[in-house]
């Protein structure tokens, strides 16, 4: 019968040829009376057999990631009679893996949005690398993720590639972060290959800033001839938030005379001081009122940032008009 062990050949051998093993008939007494032949896909081009001894050699570099298994057939013939000594037999040559592929991030580019001020541990995104090496061959395709850039704000779970927040971030200080993640095979041991990817993490706004008046004092003038409803000037607050979190409402906090009103221009986020009652220079030639500003939308959990509304003082001078 046929005698052989299982055949393995390492991929990417840089030698000209590589001895894989021996196929022989147990009737072969070593006197060169038998001839061994190799048939099948790869016979003669990838593998050869020493026709006298049955030794099998790989004669070209193999790539397991291209082909991991070769099924060949062997024949042994008695040279004297030309007859088969054994029935033709099928055998397998397995290409064994070496760590010749680095991890690759296939879903690049990565981008994530996370609310500013999110607590530690908040999940941002999961990145995943793949390795073409054999997952069943040692640690060639076992990956570990690490953070090359992004500390102290982010962390990555070593085995899953899940990126989490590790420190609160303020969008008003920095609104986006580039995080660089490395995936290393061989679970980081010597001889490991690595791949990197970049993740753009954008912070979305939360309403953590209250509007604040640009000036602590505004000076306006109004003609005593101005009709009610006249706009006599504008006041403005600024809010470091964006979008609807920066929308604000102006109102009168203090106006003993009840002469003025403030309406909000929601397009420009300005406060427009309106004459509510006609004024008379001879009766009162100046007024002092206090205005306040608040955000339009403040979720309950963010009320702590909005405890005291910003206020400003408005001095209004009445202009005299000659009367008949």
């Amino acid at each position: 019968g046929w005698v052989w062990n299982q055949f393995f050949v390492p991929e990417e051998m840089n030698t000209t040829s590589h001895h894989i093993g021996q196929l022989r008939s147990d009737l072969d007494n070593g006197n060169n009376s038998f001839q061994y032949k190799l048939l099948g896909a790869g016979a003669g081009s990838t593998f050869i057999i020493d026709e006298r001894t049955g030794d099998i050699y790989a004669i070209q570099k193999l790539d397991r990631e291209e082909r991991s298994l070769y099924i060949l057939r062997a024949q042994v013939i008695d040279i004297a009679t030309g007859r088969a000594v054994e029935p033709e037999s099928e055998f397998v040559i397995k290409v064994s893996d070496i760590n010749d592929n680095e991890p690759k991030f296939l879903d690049e580019p990565y981008e994530a949005i996370v609310p500013e001020m999110s607590p530690e541990g908040t999940l941002v995104i999961q990145v995943t690398a793949s390795d073409a090496d054999d997952p069943s061959s040692g640690n060639n395709a076992r990956l570990l993720y690490s953070l090359l850039q992004g500390q102290p704000y982010f962390s990555v779970e070593p085995t899953t590639g899940v990126i989490r927040i590790s420190s609160k971030m303020d969008r008003e200080l920095q609104d986006e972060y580039w995080v660089i993640i490395q995936a290393k095979d061989m679970i980081g041991q010597p001889g490991a290959l690595s791949g990197t990817t970049s993740v753009l993490i954008k912070l979305s706004d939360v309403n953590d800033n209250k509007p604040i008046f640009k000036e602590s004092l505004y000076r306006l003038t109004v003609s005593e001839s101005a009709p009610t409803g006249t706009s006599i000037g504008t006041i403005m607050a600024y809010d470091n938030d964006i979008g609807e979190n920066a929308e604000m409402d102006y109102s009168i906090e203090e106006d003993d005379s009840q002469t003025f009103d403030i309406i909000t221009n929601h397009e420009t986020q300005e406060g427009i001081v309106i004459l509510k009652k006609k004024v008379d220079f001879e009766h009162q030639n100046h007024y002092g009122i206090r205005a306040k500003v608040k955000n339009h939308h403040v979720p309950e959990q963010l009320m702590k940032y909005h405890t005291e509304a910003s206020t400003t003082f408005i001095k209004i001078q009445v202009e005299d008009v000659d009367e008949p």
């Epitope: 030698t15 000209t16 001895h19 003669g44 050869i48 057999i49 006298r52 001894t53 050699y57």
Partner: antibody, heavy 121, light 107 residues
């Protein structure tokens, strides 16, 4: 008896082309690797190129890569070396050599008598 | 590329003397080494392959030894037909490379 007979050598100008042939007999041509080796006047041996049996794999010395092409015709049991963009330093005797068996597959067990290539203007 | 270094360049010996030729590889080539003999005006002839296996028709006075990086060709008793140039060659890695040769001449 294994025999190898080279032909096609001659005088050629720099930049010119030449095609060498090696007619083989006495063995199953497609089962063996074949080689070209050259020897410049008064110098040692230099490997040029190898082709595996059946022609699936080819290998070249850096000095000829991109200029020379090795090929074989199993039906004619003939090995070829197409030489383009020839240079003065390609001047040599060119030998074809048959590969061996098993572990000596990419070896050189039988040699032809050689053919002379002279590159000169 | 594997560099093959042969020594000595020339060996002057008398008939019947023992010739010892050395060949060193720049890195290990296992036993994938061949020795060739070349006489003036002739093609090289294979003497030894696999570092120590004699080719067909090579007399027993010619022997090879060594593995890894150090190899030796020994001719136990020089005959007139042994005076020639001898080359070692590695076939373990591409590109295949030859040593520079050792000339064995009559003293």
């Amino acid at each position: 008896e294994v025999q190898l007979l080279e032909s096609g050598g001659g005088l050629v100008q720099p930049g010119g082309s030449l095609r060498l042939s090696c007619a083989a007999s006495g063995f199953t041509f497609s089962s063996y690797a074949m080689n070209w080796v050259r020897q410049a006047p008064g110098k040692g041996l230099e490997w040029v190129s190898t082709i595996s049996g059946g022609g699936a794999n080819t290998y070249y010395a850096d000095s000829v890569k991109g200029r020379f092409t090795i090929s074989s015709d199993n039906s004619k049991s003939t090995l070829y070396l197409q030489m383009n963009s020839l240079r003065a330093e390609d001047t040599a005797v060119y030998y074809c050599a048959k590969g061996g068996m098993g572990g000596y597959y990419y070896g050189m067990d039988v040699w032809g008598q050689g053919t002379t290539v002279t590159v000169s203007s | 590329e594997i560099v093959m270094t042969q020594s000595p360049v020339t060996l002057s010996l008398s008939l019947g003397e023992r010739a010892t030729l050395s060949c060193r590889a720049s890195q290990s080539i296992s036993s994938n080494l061949a020795w060739f003999q070349q006489k003036p005006g002739q093609a090289p002839r294979l003497l030894i392959y696999g570092a120590f296996t004699r080719a067909t028709g090579i007399p027993a006075r010619v022997s090879g030894s060594g593995s890894g990086t150090e190899f030796t060709l020994t001719i136990s008793s020089l005959q007139s037909e042994d005076f020639a140039v001898y080359y070692c060659q590695q076939y373990n890695y591409w590109p295949l490379t030859f040593g520079g040769g050792t000339k064995v001449e009559i003293k």
